[in-house]
């Protein structure tokens, strides 16, 4: 969480980031408030970036204002127009891109003051897994598939029967290029597998952990994955 | 009790598909297991033939490439194979069954002798 | 796929006589389950998980083994024990049966 304050002149008033991850090929968000104005034309919104000429994004009078644009965020940027009244300066970025990660500034204009925060944008690839029984396979084996990673994540086996157990003898994981030639597909496979045990398949980088478990018994399975992004610090 | 229920034509020209029937009583298909169909030739080698698992994922026996599906109606609480293109070679008494994930067959049907004749 | 090959293929014992049959799988398993048939009926379960006997199996049966070496023994052969007994392995695909041991009594 990073909190700025104005400084000189006006009085300065709090902005509040949060540190977030940007999913490539989809779209995010820049999380940013800041203390609230009765009048909507008094507020200005500007988002930039360290080491980017233009700026990000700009909102003032009630509408974008975009003629300071930068070439690289043309036609990607939008800020929620109806919640800025509240003190909502969050900016949504469309169509993710690697080269989107960097430090951003949310600057705040209000009648009440200036301020300022900064914000750690980080950009990768992450999905949720999915841990199936391999039918197809010539022993008890599970596989867990997730579509869309990047950078390269480690791939973790865990079981809840065998707590602490090592499986990186009895499971084999490999990386295949996606077609857009960043992202890949991770598949993990584990051998020697138990009937009445939850597996878990664990893939982690630096953006995002994700968990996909899977409760096997004779006669049944049972599937759950969840996903966290990592880092997500307030500012 | 568990009981499953064979039901099919006896007799298919070669060329032709057969489908069978599976009726189970007891368990609901949906609720667990994998249903499976198992043939005895009549030399009386057996072969597993395939599933359906009680989420509707199928498993099939490479041996029988593409011509075999296995279906369901769960209203019915039944189960069905069908295997294209048959030859006098799938002449054979037809089982379904229970199987248990990885292990065994707990419960059978009392088999459906098929011939494929012209 | 994984082979399953039982002997002998036909047996004979005189009753009261201790009988073994083999298994060998052309790659390990975890366990093997036997199935009773006699003739004109399906096959039963009759030891699964390797050694535990299915419900109302005589307890002179017994199944032994690990990885690609199991066995059923009757510990003293009895006129109903007369039957085709088969191996099967129903965790490696496709799942496999062995060919079978027929045993006669004398």
């Known amino acids: 969480l990073i909190i700025g304050f104005g400084i000189s002149g006006r009085h300065s008033i709090t902005v509040t980031t949060v540190a977030s991850a940007g999913n490539i090929g989809e779209d995010g968000i820049l999380s940013c408030t800041f203390e609230p104005d009765i009048k909507l034309s008094d507020i200005v919104i500007q988002w930039l970036k360290e080491g980017v000429l233009g700026l990000v994004h700009e909102f003032k009078e009630g509408k974008d204002e975009l003629s300071e644009q930068d070439e690289m965020f043309r036609g990607r940027t939008a800020v929620f127009a109806d919640q800025v009244i509240v003190g909502n300066a969050s900016l949504r970025l469309k169509n993710v891109q690697l080269t989107d990660a960097g430090t951003y500034k949310c600057y705040i204009i209000t009648s009440k003051g200036k301020g300022n925060a900064n914000l750690e944008y980080k950009t990768g690839a992450f999905s949720m897994p999915e841990v199936n029984v391999d039918y197809n396979a010539s022993s008890e084996t599970l596989r867990c598939e997730a579509p869309r990673w990047f950078p390269q994540p480690t791939v973790v086996w865990a079981s809840q029967v065998d707590q602490g157990a090592n499986f990186s003898e009895v499971s084999n994981t490999s990386f295949e290029l996606n077609s857009e030639n960043v992202t890949m597909k991770v598949v993990s496979v584990l051998y020697n597998v138990t009937i009445n045990n939850t597996y878990s398949c664990m893939i982690e980088n630096d953006i995002a952990k994700a968990t996909g478990d899977i409760k096997v018994t004779e006669s049944e399975i049972k599937r759950r994955s969840h996903l966290q992004l990592l880092n997500s610090k307030a500012s | 009790d568990v009981q499953l229920q064979e039901s099919g034509p006896g007799l298919v020209k070669p060329s032709q598909s057969l489908s069978l029937t599976c009726s189970v009583t007891g368990y609901s298909i949906t609720s667990g297991y994998f249903w499976s169909w198992i043939r005895q030739f009549p030399g009386n080698k057996l072969e597993w033939m395939g599933f359906?698992?009680?989420?509707?994922?199928?498993s099939y026996n490479p041996s029988l490439k593409n011509r075999i599906s296995i279906t369901r109606d769960t209203s019915k609480n039944q189960f069905f194979l069908r295997l294209n293109s048959v030859t006098k070679e799938d002449t054979a008494t037809y089982y379904c069954?229970?199987?248990?994930?990885?292990?065994?067959?707990?419960?059978w049907g009392q088999g459906t002798t098929l011939t494929v004749s012209s | 796929e994984n082979v399953l090959t039982q002997s002998p293929a036909i047996m004979s014992a005189s009753p009261g006589e201790k009988v073994t049959m083999t298994c060998s799988a052309s790659?390990?398993?975890?366990?093997m389950h036997w199935y009773q048939q006699k003739s004109s009926t399906s096959p039963k379960l009759w030891i699964y998980?390797?050694?535990k006997l299915a419900s109302g199996v005589p307890g002179r049966f017994s199944g032994s083994g690990s990885g690609n070496s199991y066995s059923l023994t009757i510990s003293s052969m009895e006129a109903e024990d007369v039957a085709t007994y088969y191996c099967?392995?129903?965790?490696?695909?496709?799942?496999?049966f062995g060919s079978g041991t027929k045993l006669e009594i004398k």
């Open positions: 790659s390990s398993v975890s366990y």
């Open positions: 069954a229970r199987k248990l994930l990885w292990l065994r067959f707990d419960y």
């Open positions: 099967f392995q129903g965790s490696g695909y496709p799942f496999t």
């Open positions: 998980d390797t050694s």
């Open positions: 359906i698992s009680y989420d509707g994922t199928n």
